[in-house]
Interface confidence: low
């Protein structure tokens, strides 16, 4: 199929990094500066993404691949391919429409991004609070009172730590 296609369409012979120039009898021309083609057989090259403003260049554009952006310090990526940059907040805060706000009592955020999440409810697991929660840290659940009674086995494996939920990247 590929051989037949190339006999019928000279453009299929143009490799990535070139475009098939209809104005030059379908000769493969190199992508000009600031543009790229990531696949063969392209009739135009695509212009390179610009990482400007809060975006900064993570990977330069080449003739065969687009530039990749990340965010300047104080911001983090959101969306596929870092399509947006969102402002960082401090630990113990979350980003709202009015800017960074402290986590409400009973919630925490241990990252510079994402939302405040409720403290773990130790009593749901039959445990007690060993270390109180803060805006920046979850509570630490300790053993239940029964675990501390005389004769209790000291080799009972601890319950797995509850992993804090991850906010979407």
């Amino acid at each position: 199929f590929e051989r037949t296609r190339s006999l019928q369409d000279p453009c299929s012979n143009c490799p990535a990094g070139t475009f098939c120039d209809n104005n030059r009898n379908q000769i493969c021309s190199p992508c000009p500066p600031n543009s790229f083609s990531s696949a063969g057989g392209q009739r135009t090259c695509d212009i390179c993404r610009q990482c400007k403003g809060v975006f900064r260049t993570r990977k330069e554009c080449s003739s065969t691949s687009n530039a990749e952006c990340d965010c300047t310090p104080g911001f983090h990526c959101l969306g596929a391919g870092c399509s947006m940059c969102e402002q960082d907040c401090k630990q113990g805060q979350e980003l709202t429409k009015k800017g960074c706000k402290d986590c409400c009592f009973g919630t925490f955020n241990d990252q510079k991004r994402g939302i405040c999440r409720p403290w773990t409810n130790c009593s749901l697991d039959g445990k007690s609070v060993l270390v109180n929660g803060t805006k920046e840290r979850d509570v630490v659940c300790g053993p239940s009172p029964a675990d501390l009674s005389p004769g209790a086995s000291s080799v009972t494996p601890p319950a797995p730590a509850r992993e804090p939920g991850h906010s979407p990247q």
Epitope: P32, P33, N34, I47, Q50
Partner: antibody
Framework: QVQLVQSGAEVKKPGASVKVSCKAS????????MHWVRQAPGQGLEWMGI????????SYAQKFQGRVTMTRDTSTSTVYMELSSLRSEDTAVYYC?????????????WGQGTLVTVSS | QSVLTQPPSVSGSPGQSITISCTGT?????????VSWYQQHPDKAPKLLIY???ERPSGISNRFSGSKSGNTATLTISGLQPEDEADYYC???????????FGTGTKVTVL
């Protein structure tokens, strides 16, 4: 400060070739591309092509394909535009213009222009 | 060779605002946010006024502003001054094999 200094005026006969130079100073030569643009008397601007001084890669307007050659000499920070098979309608002022990678090829600094007259 | 279409002339009195349109196609103005505007006084080289549709290089007065809607870009000159009398050209990166194209040019007259 950024400067683009072009070679002097030329008078050529039809069928001849002309080579115009553009010497850059005041910035890192290889970090900007260079346009060539021409303007016939009383007419508008016409894009001819662009050269990447780093590797010498070029892209020419289809109208000038086969007749124009753009080259560069990194040792002297100079770009050249040679136009062959001259005809009377090639009489124009030829400009070089520096363009930044990240600004959609906008020409931010321009040479003073070189008048090329084609006359028998 | 395709060119972008501009009105041949625009005029205004000192202090007034004027606009210059630049109409292209879905392969240039409509496709990319890479429209530039240039000012050219008689017997002088062009000077960059606007790039990337609406960005001003340092040293360019904020009386010059750019915008775009669909396939048409617009240059606005506010508080028109005598020294604004010149030719104005738009330019755009394009997806055609001729990778950059200029407008037809507009002569601005200050009455």
């Amino acid at each position: 400060q950024v400067q683009l200094v072009q070679s002097g005026a030329e008078v050529k006969k039809p069928g001849a070739s002309v080579k115009v130079s553009c010497k850059a100073s005041g910035y890192t030569f290889t970090t900007y591309y260079m346009h060539w643009v021409r303007q016939a008397p009383g007419q508008g601007l016409e894009w001819m092509g662009i050269i990447n001084p780093t590797g010498g890669s070029t892209s020419y307007a289809q109208k000038f394909q086969g007749r124009v050659t753009m080259t560069r000499d990194t040792s002297t920070s100079t770009v050249y535009m040679e136009l062959s098979s001259l005809r009377s309608e090639d009489t124009a002022v030829y400009y070089c213009a520096r363009t930044e990678y990240s600004s959609g090829w906008a020409g931010d600094y321009w040479g003073q222009g070189t008048l090329v007259t084609v006359s028998s | 060779q395709s060119v972008l279409t501009q009105p041949p002339s625009v005029s205004g009195s000192p202090g007034q605002s004027i606009t210059i349109s630049c109409t292209g196609t879905s392969r240039d103005v409509g496709l990319y946010n890479y429209v530039s505007w240039y000012q050219q006084h008689p017997d002088k080289a062009p000077k960059l006024l606007i790039y990337d549709v609406s960005e001003r290089p340092s040293g360019i007065s904020n009386r010059f502003s750019g915008s775009k809607s669909g396939n048409t870009a617009t240059l606005t000159i506010s508080g028109l001054q005598p020294e604004d009398e010149a030719d104005y050209y738009c330019g755009s990166y394009t997806s055609s094999s001729t990778r950059y194209v200029f407008g037809t040019g507009t002569k601005v007259t200050v009455l």
